[in-house]
């Protein structure tokens, strides 16, 4: 056969169905390859062919679009599963041709089970909540072409293997999950099951997301340093290992970037020439509020290192903030058979 | 340039109604709260309330719940202070400023002078 | 409500000279979090007020580097170590940890 574009393998695109569900799955060639659409490409007399491998074979074959109610089938550039089986699991791939033009992309399909509580496999997208915001909701996703607006289906809403009746703060309402005001306590998997009726069959979507409550932006203050302060003074003796610790409180900030850097003398450390070695550590609050700890490492200081300038900045989306250490040379003690004698007249 | 414009000076009479704007610019408006505080003459600064404009939750100060109205729109990045009766004891600078949560009010307005009188 | 105390409430200086100014909240401003929720303001005649200090002792961008502020809990100073004429003004301390904030009765700097 004739030379094809061949996209390869795309493991971005790791889509997980569940067992025994309807599934529709897009050819990725026009979401993220190509520069047309599907219709475009009809227009120009190009046909979408479907074929798969299964798990664990090497062999590539043609899918069967004439099973029983049409289990499998495609309609324009998306594949149709009416419902999956476990065993539909493996790689698919959609070419695009005509005589002069071929195009392809594989992708991996996995049909996962679950069990009477939702649990499975499956790779669960995570939805941020605010705490103690207000009103907040979360949506039942990917539902969107199962069925058409004319059709009402009924979805009901589990907090782990509890269906959400009667909850304080959380309101079934449709396709919306409403969070009258967020707790920590509200972290958790949330399941809609969406159940609709075609062609005289009934299917169900089980879609399961993890809510994690977060800090509020109404709360978020601006970096906080809380070491180097003016409580500590690092005084060393030339030799000795000079470490300061920077550690620096973050609020939670959605996609924002926390930075914590030193600067020696205002230069960044490594355009300094001194043997400087600087470990970071991070945790993370309940509410993912960030404290960052960068250690400033000298192993052995000289005289000249202890009169810079050591200073810890950090930097989020709501501000820049920067602190000094105080270091200092220590001041030998005196030695008592010189200094000490002499000032009590020995000889 | 991060800035606060408020509206312009006012003389108004007693029981009149007044309603005073503060407009951001250059920053994500409905990311921080926009605080009001008076200041009556030769006195100190009197914190009276703030809102978030994203959804407008507000709080006030108890010495002036009730007394005036603090609200937003998102839409024009404008905060608004409001009277629906003057009294003398109003005269004062309003000033609007932005604050992150619970502190750090680092942009303010340039004040709104408020005159009542008859 | 959470009370402001400032002290003095007049403070005379003489350019070049140190000068400190202290706050008292009636309760502890120490937040969860491990911050001081106090901010620190100065108002020069005529202008709006500026900020200082936040958080207890961060300073705020652009403010010159003989402003310092120190404490935790209920006790807070405002120190300028070199105090200049443009310095002249009321300073204010501000609680922020709860949602009804307070401003303490201000302290008037001016050169001697």
């Known amino acids: 056969s004739e030379r094809c574009d061949d996209w390869g393998l795309d493991t971005m695109r790791q889509i997980q169905v569940f067992e025994d569900e309807p599934a529709r799955i897009k050819c990725p060639l026009f979401e993220h390859f190509l520069k047309f659409n599907y219709s475009t490409a009809h227009s120009a007399g190009l046909t979408l062919i479907w074929y798969w491998t299964r798990q664990d074979r090497d062999l590539e074959e043609p899918i069967n679009f004439r099973l029983p109610e049409n289990r499998i089938s495609k309609e324009k550039d998306v594949l149709w599963f009416r419902p999956t089986l476990l065993n539909d699991t493996g790689n698919y791939t959609c070419m695009l041709r005509n005589t002069t033009y071929c195009s392809k992309v594989a992708f991996p399909l996995e049909v996962v089970q679950k069990d009477s509580c939702f649990n499975s496999p499956m790779k669960l997208p995570v939805h941020k909540l605010y705490i103690e915001y207000g009103i907040q909701r979360i949506t039942c996703p990917n539902v969107d072409g199962y069925f058409p607006s004319s059709v009402k289906p009924t979805i009901t809403w589990y907090m782990g293997c509890y269906k959400i009746q009667n909850f304080n703060n959380v309101i079934p309402e449709g396709m919306n999950l409403s969070f009258l005001i967020a707790f920590i306590s509200n972290n958790g998997n949330y399941t809609c099951v969406v159940t609709y009726p075609e062609n005289g069959r009934t299917f169900h979507l089980t879609r399961t997301l993890t809510v994690k409550v977060v800090g509020s932006p109404k709360n978020a203050v601006p970096p906080v340093i809380h070491s180097p302060n003016d409580h500590v003074v690092y005084e060393k003796e030339p030799g000795e290992e000079l470490l300061i610790p920077c550690t620096v409180y973050f609020s939670f900030l959605m996609d924002s970037r926390n930075e914590v850097w030193w600067t020696i003398d205002g230069k960044k450390p490594d355009d300094i020439p001194i043997d400087v070695t600087i470990n970071e550590s991070i945790s993370h609050s309940r509410t993912e509020d960030e404290t960052r700890t960068q250690i400033l490492s000298i192993k052995k200081v000289t005289s000249e290192d202890l009169k810079r300038s050591y200073v810890c900045h950090a930097r989020s989306a709501k501000g820049e903030v920067a602190k000094a250490a105080t270091v200092k040379q220590k001041v030998p003690a005196p030695r008592y058979t010189v200094e000490l004698a002499c000032g009590f007249g020995a000889t | 340039e991060v800035q606060l414009v408020q509206s312009g000076a006012e003389v108004k009479k007693p029981g009149e109604s007044l309603k005073i704007s503060c407009k951001g610019s250059g920053y994500s408006f409905t990311s921080y709260w926009i605080g009001w505080v008076r200041q009556m003459p030769g006195k100190g600064l009197e914190w009276m309330g703030i809102?978030?404009?994203?959804?407008?939750?507000?709080r006030y100060s108890p010495s002036f719940q009730g007394q005036v109205t603090i609200s937003a729109d998102k839409s024009v990045n404008t905060a608004y202070l409001q009277w629906i009766s003057l009294k003398a004891s109003d005269t004062a600078i309003y000033y609007c400023?932005?604050?992150?949560?619970?502190?750090?009010?680092?942009?303010w307005g340039q004040g709104t002078t408020v005159t009542v009188s008859s | 409500d959470i009370v402001m105390t400032q002290s003095p409430l007049s403070l005379p200086v003489t350019p070049g000279e140190p000068a400190s100014i202290s706050c008292r909240s009636s309760?502890?401003?120490?937040?969860?979090?491990?911050?001081?929720?106090l901010d620190w303001y100065l108002q020069k005649p005529g202008q709006s007020p500026q900020l200082l200090i936040y958080?207890?002792?961060n300073r705020a961008s652009g403010v010159p580097d003989r402003f310092s502020g120190s404490g935790s809990g209920t006790d807070f100073t405002l120190k300028i170590s070199r105090v200049e004429a443009e310095d002249v003004g009321l300073y204010y301390c501000?609680?922020?940890?709860?949602?009804?904030?307070?401003f303490g009765q201000g302290t008037r700097v001016e050169i001697k």
């Open positions: 309760q502890s401003l120490l937040h969860s979090n491990g911050y001081n929720t």
């Open positions: 501000m609680q922020g940890l709860q949602t009804q904030w307070t």
């Open positions: 958080l207890g002792s």
């Open positions: 809102i978030w404009p994203g959804d407008s939750d507000t």
């Open positions: 400023a932005r604050s992150s949560g619970g502190t750090a009010m680092d942009v």
